[in-house]
């Protein structure tokens, strides 16, 4: 038993972030003449928290009226709650002394934790793009959550993934915490339309995760394929050659014609058709005429995709003297392009 | 049950020092503080000091330069010395508990004459 | 020093009737919404006994006969109604500041 005893009922409160906390505290006693202190902290370096004697504290109101003749409540309520207030809160009885007020009895402390909701993952993906085959990294960052415990899942296209690392920071005690995950996927030429989610789970959420994308489409490319062909003459000496350029993405892309290494025409793909996976297909043709050349004829599509080294595609026309049935052709055997005859 | 007793000295010479012993039962004295008040002979009563629980000491400003209170908290005693004595501090005086001054001692008499 | 002065010094009632002692302060006595006056009965022989605290409430085993009331720096003890052995003298004490003081006292004789 004592003269006077502060008695704060709650050893802990737990408190949302945003909402307000009530700090409980009774004296048994109004005797010794003195006010009531709150702090956050014990020690030299005690946060004041309200003053009964005096200054502003705009945060905090009083459960009951301090003025009121024999109250002994000095509950404190703290408005707009963070997850910086955390910590252990004392009600702190001073008596007057001369000529400086001096601390009497002290409660026991209630420990504020405060729920503090993960801020929106965001996930990232590598700088540059990748093509398919290829392992690349995602990260999934979320911040300002407490307590610590918290899990994190990562998924493509509704299917979890398992290669990944997270880490919670810091390690030991915090006002809150930060979660950072980074996951391998590896890339598909299917992948322009997929997701990646990265999905954090919280006791503040409620059974209701949060999510954070990212579309692979962002981080894929994929090269095209280049096949040109030769059309049925159009005129008597005139052969239409086409590039047709096949299942590519991004759409950035260039394509440059040449005959016999130089440069016949540059022009960059506009009116693409759009696959069903995402991806781009554009034809390009070019109309030679034959009988401005004396000798064969090397025609090369070269591609420049996305700002990547060209690819390129050949086809020989033969200029021959020896005319043969019209429309027939044979393919050169043992090359890498299409050979056509031309009469 | 609570209970406070004074004992000490009944004749203290002038110019001595007077010292008094609180003797209490039925509380902590680390719990409570302990006063001393004194009441000349047909007079009113006379605060001298206070030793509170943690052993501070709060003291009337009319006689601080010659008061001393103490605790001996294992013994359950508070000692009251007073230097200087003259006729004017003879008086009864008292223990009382805490600030609010709710258990009193029977009160000893102390003479002070030569 | 905050001066306590007790009126009247002395006082004689009749049984039944009201007695009633003011205690005017030099300086307030109040703080923190309280009033740090108390009032203590003291019988020939015996040491003070505590009737009243903060101003109004009643020390426990204290007759409800007895009330306090006041603020700042003017205090009543009331005696309602007073009978035979409330006979003794009655001080007003203030711990609102330091030093503490008593007031001088007012004697109460039963008719």
């Known amino acids: 038993e004592e003269e006077l005893q502060v008695i704060q009922p709650d050893k802990s409160v737990l408190v949302a972030a945003g909402e307000t906390a009530t700090l409980r505290c009774t004296a048994t006693s109004l005797i010794p003449v003195g006010p009531i202190q709150w702090f956050r902290g014990a020690g030299p370096g005690r946060e004041l928290i309200y003053n009964q004697k005096e200054g502003h504290f705009p945060r905090v109101t009083t459960v009951s009226d301090l003025t009121k003749r024999n109250n002994m409540d000095f509950s404190i309520r703290i408005g707009n709650i963070t997850p910086a207030d955390a910590g252990t809160y004392y009600c702190v009885k001073f008596r007057k002394g001369s000529p400086d007020d001096v601390e009497f009895k002290s409660g026991a402390g209630t420990e504020l934790s405060v729920r503090a909701k993960p801020s929106a993952p965001v996930v990232s993906g590598p700088a540059a793009r990748a093509t398919p085959q290829h392992t690349v990294s995602f990260t999934c960052e979320s911040h300002g959550f407490s307590p610590r415990d918290i899990t994190l899942k990562w998924f493509k296209n509704g299917n979890e993934l398992s290669d990944f690392q997270t880490n919670v920071d810091p390690v030991g005690e915090s006002v809150s915490y930060s979660i950072h995950s980074t996951a391998k996927v590896v890339l598909t030429r299917e992948d322009v339309h997929s997701q990646v989610i990265c999905e954090v789970a919280h006791v503040t959420l409620q059974g209701d995760p949060l999510r954070g994308t990212a579309n692979l489409s962002e981080t894929i490319r994929v090269p095209p394929t280049l096949e040109v062909t030769q059309q049925p003459v159009r005129a008597e000496n005139q052969v239409n050659v086409t590039c047709q350029v096949r299942k590519f993405y991004p759409q950035r892309l260039q394509l440059t014609w040449l005959e016999n290494g130089n440069v016949s025409r540059t022009e960059t793909a506009s009116t693409v058709t759009e696959n069903k996976d995402g991806t781009y297909n554009w034809m390009s043709w070019l109309l030679v005429n034959v009988s401005a050349h004396r000798d064969d004829v090397k025609l090369t599509c070269q591609v420049e995709h996305d700002g990547q080294p060209a690819v390129s595609k050949s086809h020989d026309l033969k200029v021959s003297a020896h005319p043969k049935e019209q429309g027939s052709n044979t393919a050169a055997e043992n090359t890498g392009s299409n050979e056509r005859n031309i009469y | 049950q609570v209970q406070l007793q004074e004992s000490g000295p009944g004749l203290v010479k002038p110019s001595q020092t007077l010292s008094l012993t609180c003797t209490v039962s039925?509380?902590?004295?680390?719990?409570?503080?302990v006063n001393w008040i004194r009441q000349p002979p047909g007079k009113g009563l006379e605060w001298i000091g206070i030793?509170?629980?943690?052993?501070?000491?709060d003291y009337n400003s009319a006689l601080k330069s010659r008061v001393t209170i103490s605790v001996d908290t294992s013994k359950n005693q508070v000692f009251l010395k007073l230097s200087s004595v003259t006729a004017a501090d003879t008086a009864v005086y008292y223990c009382?508990?805490?600030?609010?001054?709710?258990?009193w001692g029977q009160g000893t008499t102390v003479t002070v004459s030569s | 020093d905050i001066v306590l002065t007790q009126s009247p010094a002395s006082l004689a009632v009749s049984p039944g009737q009201r007695a009633t002692i003011t205690c005017r302060a030099s300086?307030?006595?109040?703080?923190?919404?309280?009033?740090?006056m108390h009032w203590y009965q003291q019988k020939p022989g015996q040491p003070p006994k505590p009737l009243i605290y903060?101003?109004?409430n009643l020390e426990s085993g204290v007759p409800a006969r007895f009330s306090g009331s006041g603020s700042g720096t003017d205090f009543t003890l009331t005696i309602n109604p007073v009978e035979a052995n409330d006979a003794a003298n009655y001080y007003c004490?203030?711990?609102?500041?330091?030093?503490?003081?008593f007031g001088g006292g007012t004697k109460v004789e039963i008719k």
């Open positions: 009382a508990r805490a600030g609010k001054m709710d258990y």
């Open positions: 039925g509380f902590s004295l680390t719990g409570y503080g």
């Open positions: 030793i509170w629980g943690d052993g501070s000491t």
């Open positions: 300086e307030s006595v109040d703080s923190y919404g309280n009033s740090f």
């Open positions: 903060l101003a109004s």
């Open positions: 004490q203030q711990n609102n500041e330091y030093p503490w003081t």
